[in-house]
């Protein structure tokens, strides 16, 4: 008789693929527009992305350190009117996009909590969950909790409020902290809490301590969903060089949990690059022409318009990776296992039941090396082949599709493989 | 049981004032939002604001911002609507309506459980 089929988890639209966070509606747009009328003609583009969710915003009135005029049920009008928004939240959910409201209360001041008036903002926020439910958001973000005092007891509260309305309802926060025993602590209380932090931006781009990370982080955590990303809020290209954006966006997408990326991520927009242009918000450069400021700074390679066209770009590695992760269910919600592969090397196994299953190789090096796959770390259930077929590289020049016998490895400097093979019982 | 009386309401000149107050008895409303609609003779029944529970956050139609405030005593069981500035086209018949579910009423009238008879406000230019 055939195995029993393993009984499929229980999977929440946020587990199905990646996030994508809109801190900057005016960045985002470019050329003086930035606004929601404006954003609901960019969801084409988030649908081809293949993302679930849009983190959007804050986009509520907020006049710098004032309490009085911060009002998280008013948009702020530069942004657009509450028609707008509504507008918006019904075309998102024709095209299967979640949104995600960030409701951060001071996001223009110094203290993004009002440190003198928590328990003001933290009421004002409990209602502003409420009103905005019921206008039909998917869930919320609230950034830089660190500065929340008593954070663990009101997000309890908030999410006790976004759960009791639906149990498909998401609550989100960000924190700047890498610190594992705290982002542990702040997790603890909240059991369906979606945390993003700084916990991997400091990975010292090596194997090894990437490896070390996450296999920490995955066991500290036990069974609990994750989610993924370098930061609470900005650009891979704040912590990465050019050379590891790829191989992070094979690693993000294939690591049990949720992806969150911040816009331009997928094409690696550098502020670094564009002079004048504010770290954590610069302009997304949809063609040659959204950064005028510096006649010739932007190639069409560094553009969306550029790379669409380019089968070999970054743009191009995120879509193909995005559509894998959201239809595969060894990448869905498979097992983990991460294995020794020899030094500079990542690797593991994401497997489900008799599903095909995926072997991931990252080598975080500058130099090109021989992987050693010790199948010796991996128990029974996550035994590997001699050969597994190539999905796909980071780097071109492979033939994808061909078999690749995993004794004799080699991966080029900061190449990242993605492998399939089936299941054998 | 939630059992909702307006009273307040009246005939004024345009660019005048009025305060609306709504009594609400058989139970405390301190744990709901609660929400001011009004309805003019042959249209729909439209929103004007909601207060949360607190009194802490008020949301008002594009309409009557900065001319109308919502408050609530909830020791006394009541809700306020101080109209200023009234224009003719703010005539209408005003309700007050509870929304034992939520802390924070909505727009959509449908949220709320509970409904007074209404108080007439005539605005005359």
């Known amino acids: 008789r055939a195995p029993r089929c393993r009984e499929l988890p229980a999977q929440k639209w946020w587990h199905t693929g990646a996030l994508y966070r809109i801190g900057d509606l005016q960045a985002f747009q470019g050329h003086g527009a930035g606004n929601l009328a404006g954003l609901k003609g960019r969801l084409d583009y988030l649908s081809s992305l293949k993302v679930k969710g849009l983190v959007l915003g804050p986009i509520h009135k907020n006049q710098k350190d004032d309490v009085a005029q911060t009002d998280l049920l008013q948009i702020d009008p530069n942004f657009g009117s509450k028609e707008d928004f509504d507008s918006l939240l019904q075309s998102a959910k024709k095209k299967s996009i979640r949104v995600i409201l960030d409701l951060t209360p001071n996001y223009r001041g110094e203290n993004s909590w009002f440190s003198t008036q928590v328990d003001t903002v933290a009421t004002k926020v409990k209602d502003a969950l409420e009103f905005w439910l019921q206008a039909g958001v998917d869930g919320f973000q609230v950034r830089d909790i660190e500065n929340l005092k008593d954070a663990s007891s009101f997000l309890a509260e908030w999410q006790n409020i976004t759960k009791g309305f639906s149990e498909d309802r998401l609550l989100i926060a960000g924190t700047n902290s890498s610190d594992l025993q705290q982002i542990l602590s702040l997790l603890e209380s909240n059991k369906d809490l979606l945390l993003t932090s700084s916990y991997l931006s400091d990975s010292g781009s090596t194997g090894e301590h990437t490896k070390s990370l996450v296999t920490q982080y995955l066991n500290a955590t036990g069974n609990r969903w994750c989610s993924w990303s370098l930061s609470q809020a900005r650009l891979l290209t704040s912590f990465l060089p050019a050379q590891l954006l790829r191989l992070y966006q094979l690693m993000l997408f294939t690591l049990p949990g949720t992806p969150v990326f911040s816009y331009g991520d997928e094409i690696g927009l550098d502020a670094a690059a564009l002079p004048g242009q504010p770290m954590e918000a610069p302009v997304m450069l949809w063609d040659e022409s959204s950064f005028p400021d510096i006649p010739g700074a932007v190639s069409a390679n560094m553009t969306v318009k550029g790379q669409s066209e380019d089968p070999g770009s970054l743009l191009s590695l995120f879509r193909r990776l995005s559509d894998q992760r959201s239809k595969e269910r060894s990448l869905l919600h498979g097992d983990f296992h991460a294995f020794s592969a020899g030094p500079g090397l990542f690797s593991y196994i994401r497997h489900w039941d008799q599903n095909e299953r995926f072997l991931v190789v990252l080598n975080f090096g500058d130099v090109g090396l021989s992987a050693g796959l010790q199948a010796s770390d991996l128990p029974a259930s996550a035994s590997l082949p001699a050969k597994a077929d190539l999905l796909l590289s980071t780097q071109p020049g492979r033939e994808e599709g061909s078999p690749l016998e995993l004794e004799r490895l080699k991966l080029e400097p900061h190449e990242g493989l993605l492998l399939r093979f089936p299941y054998a019982a | 049981q939630v059992h909702l009386v307006e009273s307040g309401g009246g005939l004024v000149q345009a660019g005048g004032s009025l305060r609306l107050s709504c009594a609400a008895s058989?139970?405390?409303?301190?744990?709901?939002?609660m929400g001011w609609f009004r309805q003019a003779p042959g249209k729909e029944r439209e929103f004007v604001g909601t207060i949360s529970c607190s009194g802490t956050s008020t949301y008002y139609t594009d309409s009557v911002k900065g001319r109308f405030t919502i408050s609530r005593d909830n020791a006394k069981n009541t809700v306020y609507l101080e109209m200023n500035s009234l224009k003719p086209e703010d005539t209408a018949v005003y309700f007050c309506a509870a929304d034992t579910r939520h802390c924070m009423g909505y727009t959509k009238h449908g949220g709320y459980d509970y409904w007074g008879q209404g108080t007439q406000v005539t605005v005359s230019s």
């Open positions: 058989g139970r405390t409303i301190s744990t709901y939002g």
